[in-house]
Interface confidence: low
C-alpha cells in the first residue's frame, strides 16, 4: 500500500527558548536560561512552558507597546516581544514557546512611541530537539529519533 | 504508564471472522511515528508478525495472510482492531498487540488466546 | 521474505557460564532485535539496534554483529535467564522473527 510520502519539515523548525527551572519565575528568558543537565527536564520544563502559554492572555499580547508595570523582560523591552507555540508533530517536544517582535520598528524611550527609524529584529539561538525521522512509504523499518539543534528566537532587540 | 490489551472471541468455528481488539492507554495513535501491530504465537511455536498500522493511517500485512486480514484503529478510543477472515485451526494462537515506535516493539500486550474448532 | 534461522534451537548452561546464540538472515538487514519469552509471559525486548540494551535490561546482555549474521551474548548465565530467544528483522516487509533459541539452566 505505498502512498505519497509525508512532507516533513527537517532542520527548518523554530521551537521557543530554553525553560526556567523549578522555583523561578517563568517566561523571563532573556535572564533566565540555564543549562539542563537532562533532556528530561529540559522538556518537561518547555512543556511547563507551553501550558503557561496557553493559559496567559498577557505572554500572547500583540500590541505593540512597552509596559514598565510587569516584571517580563518581554514586556519591559524597547523592542518588545511575545510568545506563540510553534508546533510540529515530528518534533519532540512537539510544542515550543517561539519569541515574535510587537513592533516593526523600537518603542522610543524618551517618547514611549514606536519609532520606525529604527527596527525590531528576532535574536535566535539553538536549542536541542529531537526529531521523528520515518521512511516513507512504503516504510520498511521504523521512525527513529534524531537529537539536533535548531535555530529558535528567544527574544527581539532593537538595530538602526 | 503505556499499557497495551488485547481482547477476543476465545473460540469460534472454523470459516467465521475472527475479531480481535487491542486497547491502549499512556500514548497517542495520533501521535507522529507512533505505530500498532499484531503478532501472534501459536503454543509452543514461534513468532509471526501479522499487521500493523501507523499514526497516519498507513497499513501493512503480512503477504501469506493478506487476503484475509484487515486492520483499522480507533484513535479517539485509543483502540486497535485486527479482524481475520475465514479463519481455520491453524489459526488457533495466543494474539499480542505491540506498540511500535522509535525502532522497536518494546511494549506488549499480554496476549489473548484464540481457539478455532469445529 | 527474509529468512531468520537461529542456532542453536535449544542450549543450556550453568550459572555464571558464558552464552552466545547466533541469528543467520537470507539477506542483509540494517539492525537485529532481540527478544526475551518465558512461559506464560509476553515478549520482552532485550536489544534493539543490532547492540543497545532496552531500558531495564541487565548489562549481561549484549547484542553485535551485521550483515546477514547476528548474535546475541550473556557474559555470565543466571537462573532467570532461561528463556526462550527470538531476534527479528525490521529491514524489509513481512517484519520476521526466528525460530527461536530456548535456553535452559543446568
Known amino acids: 500500500q505505498p502512498r505519497s510520502p509525508k512532507s516533513k519539515r527537517k532542520g527548518q523548525g523554530r521551537p521557543g527558548p530554553l525553560a526556567p527551572g523549578p522555583h523561578q519565575v517563568p517566561l523571563d528568558l532573556v535572564s533566565r536560561m540555564k543549562p539542563y543537565a537532562r533532556m528530561e527536564e529540559y522538556e518537561r520544563n518547555i512543556e511547563e512552558m507551553v501550558a503557561q502559554l496557553r493559559n496567559s492572555s498577557e505572554l500572547a499580547q500583540r500590541k505593540c507597546e512597552v509596559n514598565l508595570q510587569l516584571w517580563m523582560s518581554n514586556k519591559r523591552s524597547l523592542s518588545p516581544w511575545g510568545y506563540s507555540i510553534n508546533h510540529d508533530p515530528s518534533r519532540i517536544p512537539v510544542d515550543l514557546p517561539e519569541a515574535r517582535c510587537l513592533c516593526l520598528g523600537c518603542v522610543n524611550p524618551f517618547t514611549m512611541q514606536e519609532d520606525r527609524s529604527m527596527v525590531s529584529v528576532p535574536v535566535f539561538s539553538q536549542v536541542p530537539v529531537r526529531r521523528r525521522l520515518c521512511p516513507p512509504p512504503p516504510r520498511t523499518g521504523p521512525c527513529r529519533q534524531r537529537a539536533v539543534m535548531e535555530t529558535i528566537a528567544v527574544g527581539c532587540t532593537c538595530i538602526f | 504508564q503505556v499499557t497495551l490489551k488485547e481482547s477476543g472471541p476465545g473460540i469460534l468455528q472454523p470459516s467465521q471472522t475472527l475479531s480481535l481488539t487491542c486497547s491502549f492507554s499512556?500514548?497517542?495513535?495520533?501521535?507522529?511515528?507512533?505505530?500498532v501491530g499484531w503478532i501472534r504465537q501459536p503454543s509452543g511455536k514461534g513468532l509471526e508478525w501479522l499487521a500493523h498500522?501507523?499514526?497516519?493511517?498507513?497499513?501493512y500485512y503480512n503477504p501469506a495472510l493478506k487476503s484475509r486480514l484487515t486492520i483499522s484503529k480507533d484513535t479517539s478510543k485509543n483502540q486497535v482492531f485486527l479482524k481475520i477472515a475465514n479463519v481455520d485451526t491453524a489459526d488457533t494462537a495466543t494474539y499480542y498487540c505491540?506498540?511500535?515506535?522509535?525502532?522497536?516493539?518494546?511494549?506488549w500486550g499480554q496476549g489473548t488466546s484464540v481457539t478455532v474448532s469445529s | 521474505q527474509i529468512v531468520l534461522t537461529q542456532s542453536p534451537a535449544i542450549m543450556s548452561a550453568s550459572p555464571g557460564e558464558k552464552v552466545t546464540m547466533t541469528c543467520s538472515a537470507s539477506s542483509s538487514v540494517s539492525y537485529m532485535y532481540w527478544y526475551q519469552q518465558k512461559p506464560g509471559s509476553s515478549p520482552r525486548l532485550l536489544i534493539y539496534d543490532t547492540s543497545n540494551l532496552a531500558s531495564g535490561v541487565p548489562v549481561r546482555f549484549s547484542g553485535s554483529g551485521s550483515g546477514t549474521s547476528y548474535s546475541l551474548t550473556i557474559s555470565r548465565m543466571e537462573a532467570e535467564d532461561a528463556a526462550t530467544y527470538y531476534c527479528q528483522q525490521w529491514s524489509s516487509y513481512p517484519f520476521t522473527f526466528g525460530s527461536g533459541t530456548k535456553l535452559e539452566i543446568k
Open positions: 498500522i501507523w499514526w497516519d493511517d498507513d497499513k
Open positions: 499512556g500514548f497517542s495513535l495520533s501521535t507522529f511515528g507512533m505505530g
Open positions: 505491540a506498540r511500535m515506535n522509535d525502532g522497536y516493539l518494546y511494549y
